[in-house]
Interface confidence: medium
């Protein structure tokens, strides 16, 4: 019906306005409505003007697109000619009454389909339904994927590419780990992936200044060390160093009036020379205190070495050895005086004898045929040595003696000359001052070591060697090496050390083979004024230990391997060190600090006497230990 109406209208238009010319009213009758008429008539007039001769001919030739009036007029009512819609975006154009309707292709909008729809911003279809990237394009859109993802065939969803499965050798010797959109080449801790070589390379943490003091790098890791010999230990962060702190303060008060006889491990502590009138006789008076059982108190000789007198201690008793042109004698007597108490001792040359008194009571009287030292040129010249003698004397002694004596003397009076001059010398030298109070034991000040040569081989035993150690300890700091066996190649095949425990105010005891801890006894309260007793026995097959809390035989998977390392070292030659380590690398043991405190050591049934050591640091006290510092009310 509609098309019939259109045909009718077209016929009327031909008749009324082309074959005849029409005015606006006549055109109104053709269209039967104002909007179409109002739209048509001005354009109709343009067509007329264009195809009328005369005035508008030039204009028509230049501007009109129609060949004749009919086609020009017929085209006026078609709102879709010329095309008002955007060519890219329209699907069809529908002519209407003085209007047009553009039908848009999908992805376009607007009256003339001139606006692209951004499907990526459509709130009803978020991101255009794309799982990753939505790319808007004129009239359309498409989904795409980020690197490392692949588009599924629905063209919307992106799936991660598993590069590890796709290219199994992508990481070389490292482990490939797939992650969304990518992959990672993973290395064990302490290694870094090298892209060029496609392999894991050790990180040199030491070059990154990870440690406060010393750093040792090894494949896959590193270890920090602190200089224990300078009093440092590794902090809990395993990187920084902290001072080894005192856990049991000791009374280290000294007095210059007290002369310390063990200042030197080898050598004389004091040397005096007397030139007196020839009528003078030898005399020595002093107070003496020691726990040591053997050693030289003083040695006196004539200027030409022809005569000498030795006052010593043997078995805790006074011993006198003398030699001159007339006689050669050795005498021991009196009570045991190595009791840690002050004992008044006097040695006096009388006309026919030498009198030895303890606490003013005569204990020995040694006959002598003539004067002890022969005067020359009207003078009696005498040399006196405290706590030792010249080296050449050793071979002349009637009975050999270990000269080292850990003891103190005070209130001395030699050759009836008093103490004048000597005190002034001693006052200047702190090392010569003796501790005010001491106890029985050996003291390691945390600054040095003692070395022994001990043969651990036991021919009668099937094990071949054994180490049975008993330690009585009263530490003053919670960290330090108590005992170490050191090989010729600077390794430490066995060590017993103390370390501050992670739990407060307690200590752990470590047994180590080289730099591996083979056993840790945890959380013992060792920093107390009471001594702690530790025992351990080790041979190539077993390790047994007893502490105040338990006795046990240690066994774990790795122990036999570690004991094999120890066995190999014991079959060679080992040196025994007490109180610390010699110059071995920091990394040779888990602990390298010196032990600080009192300690008595028994190895294979023999009580070690520090006076018998091959070498000993001068500050180690062989037979005296400072008392625990007691807090007084006014201190």
């Amino acid at each position: 019906a509609n098309s019939l109406l259109e045909e009718t209208k077209q016929g009327n238009l031909e008749r009324e306005c082309i074959e005849e010319l029409c005015n606006k009213e006549e055109a109104r009758e053709v269209f039967e409505n104002d909007p179409e008429t109002d739209y048509f008539y001005p354009k109709y007039l343009v067509c007329l003007r264009s195809f009328q001769t005369g005035l508008f001919t030039a204009a028509r030739q230049s501007t009109n697109a129609y060949p004749d009036l009919r086609s020009c007029v017929n085209a006026i009512p078609d709102q879709c000619s010329p095309l008002p819609c955007n060519e890219d975006g329209y699907m069809s154009c529908k002519d209407g009454k003085a209007s047009f309707t553009c039908t848009c292709k999908p992805g376009w909008q607007g009256e003339k389909c001139e606006f692209d729809i951004n499907e990526c911003k459509d709130p009803s279809n978020i991101n255009g339904g794309c799982s990753q990237i939505c790319d808007n394009t004129p009239g359309s859109y498409h989904c795409s994927c980020k690197n490392g993802f692949v588009m599924l065939s629905n063209k919307k969803d992106c799936k991660d590419v598993d590069e590890c499965s796709l290219k199994p050798s992508i990481c070389g010797t490292a482990v490939c780990k797939n992650i969304p959109g990518d992959f990672e080449c993973e290395c064990p801790e302490g290694y870094r992936y090298n892209l060029k070589s496609k392999s894991c390379e050790d990180i040199d943490e030491c070059s990154e200044n990870m440690c406060a003091q010393l750093c040792v790098n090894y494949p896959g890791g590193y270890t920090c060390y602190c200089d224990g010999k300078k009093g440092f230990k590794l902090a809990q962060d395993q990187k920084s160093c902290e001072v080894v702190s005192v856990c049991l303060p000791l009374n280290l008060d000294t007095k210059y009036e007290l002369l310390y006889l063990a200042e030197q491990f080898a050598g004389v502590v004091l040397y005096l020379k007397f030139r007196l009138p020839e009528i003078s006789r030898f005399s020595a008076e002093f107070d003496f205190r020691t726990y040591d059982s053997e050693g030289v108190i003083l040695y006196a000789e004539s200027i030409d070495h022809s005569a000498w007198l030795l006052i010593a201690l043997r078995g805790g008793k006074i011993e006198v050895q003398l030699k001159n042109e007339h006689t050669s004698k050795i005498t021991t007597g009196g009570d045991v005086i190595n009791n840690g108490l002050w004992n008044m001792v006097s040695v006096e040359e009388l006309e026919h004898s030498i009198s030895i008194k303890i606490a003013k009571e005569a204990v020995m009287d040694i006959n002598k045929p003539g004067p002890l030292f022969k005067p020359e040129n009207g003078l009696l010249e005498t040399k006196v040595y405290f706590a030792g003698f010249p080296r050449k004397v050793e071979s002349e002694l009637i009975k050999p003696i270990n000269p080292r004596l850990d003891g103190c003397i005070r209130s001395w009076n030699l050759m009836k000359q008093g103490a004048s001059g000597i005190k002034e010398i001693i006052q200047e030298k702190q090392n010569k001052h003796c501790l005010v109070t001491v106890e029985k034991g050996s003291y390691y000040p945390g600054s040095g070591i003692a070395q022994f040569h001990i043969d651990y081989n036991n021919v009668s035993s099937a094990e071949g060697w054994h180490v049975n150690v008993t330690l009585n300890i009263r530490p003053s700091t919670g960290t330090g090496v108590m005992l170490a066996l050191v090989s010729g190649n600077n390794t430490v095949p066995f060590a017993v050390s103390l370390v501050d425990s992670t739990s407060e105010k307690s200590q752990d005891i470590l047994l180590s083979v080289e730099n591996t801890v083979i056993y840790r006894i945890q959380a013992l309260s060792l920093c107390s004024d009471q001594q702690s007793h530790l025992e351990f026995r080790v041979n190539r097959n077993n390790l047994e230990l007893s502490t105040p809390l338990k006795i046990e035989t240690i066994s774990h998977e790795d122990l036999q391997r570690q004991l094999a390392v120890l066995d190999k070292a014991m079959k060679a030659k080992v040196a025994t060190y007490l109180g610390g380590l010699p110059d071995v690398p920091f990394s040779a043991t888990p602990v390298n600090a010196f032990y600080n405190g009192c300690m008595e050591v028994n190895i294979n049934g023999v009580q070690l006497d520090l006076d018998e050591a091959i070498s000993k640091h001068n500050d180690i006290r062989a037979h005296s230990c400072p008392s625990v510092w007691k807090k007084t009310k006014n201190s």
Epitope: S153, D162, S165, L166, P168
Partner: antibody, heavy 119, light 106 residues
């Protein structure tokens, strides 16, 4: 739109041979990884074979149960993938699906073709 | 070869009910894929990379992992969800599928 259409199924005697075809359209076939998956009530879904695209030199992979008996091939000019099955056994019976494989998952499946191995 | 064990083998749920099915393997390193299959039709990819829904899959579906156990969950069961669901993993050849969980509507 992706389309996969299998053909070539039917009844075959044990020990016999059969060739399945799969015609593909709606995607760039030469780059695609294609595969065959079969389904039976006894074994459920079971991957059979895979052939990779041109970029991967048409590398082929097989499940242990068919290795040496089945051969997967393709003709990129015809956008088709094939499965030549020899020495067939009763346990090979099932619906064989042609699949488009994307990054190790079975992205698109055909409707399937049924193979029956029976005497 | 990884063996994927799906449980339960068969389950039923009422409309609106929450449904969870699991798939256990040996590896927690790889992605899990889930397929939905309705009778007479081939399986359709449903969830990929463990938890991503394929375009067009209703948001009531979700996927997750806990250790070596993977789950497919429907927050509120609908009649159209009745189907068999298969899990699949690739951890090097061969590709492996689970035995399936058949979900029925009560």
């Amino acid at each position: 739109e992706v389309k996969l259409e299998e053909s070539g199924g039917g009844l075959v005697q044990p020990g016999g041979s059969m060739k399945l075809s799969c015609a593909a359209s709606g995607f760039t076939f030469s780059d695609a990884w294609m595969g065959w998956v079969r389904q039976s009530p006894e074994k459920g879904l079971e991957w059979v074979a895979e052939i990779r695209g041109k970029a991967n030199n048409h590398a082929t992979y097989y499940s242990e149960s068919v290795k040496g008996r089945f051969t997967i091939s393709r003709d990129d000019s015809k956008s088709s993938v094939y499965l030549q099955m020899n020495s067939l056994r009763a346990e090979d019976t099932g619906i064989f699906y042609c699949c488009l494989i994307t990054a190790f998952l079975f992205d698109y499946w055909g409707q399937g073709t049924t193979l029956t191995v029976s005497s | 070869q990884i063996v994927l064990t799906q449980s339960p083998a068969i389950m039923s749920a009422s409309p609106g009910e929450k449904v969870t099915m699991t798939c256990s393997g040996r590896s927690s390193e790889n992605y899990m894929y889930w397929y939905q299959q309705k009778p007479g039709s081939p399986p359709r990819l449903w969830i990929y990379d463990t938890s991503n829904l394929v375009s067009g899959v209703p948001a009531r579906f979700s996927g997750s992992r806990s250790g070596t156990s993977y789950s497919l969950t429907i927050s509120s069961m609908e009649a159209e969800d009745a189907a068999t669901y298969y899990c699949q993993q690739f951890n090097g050849y061969p590709y492996t599928f689970g035995g399936g969980t058949k979900l029925e509507i009560r």
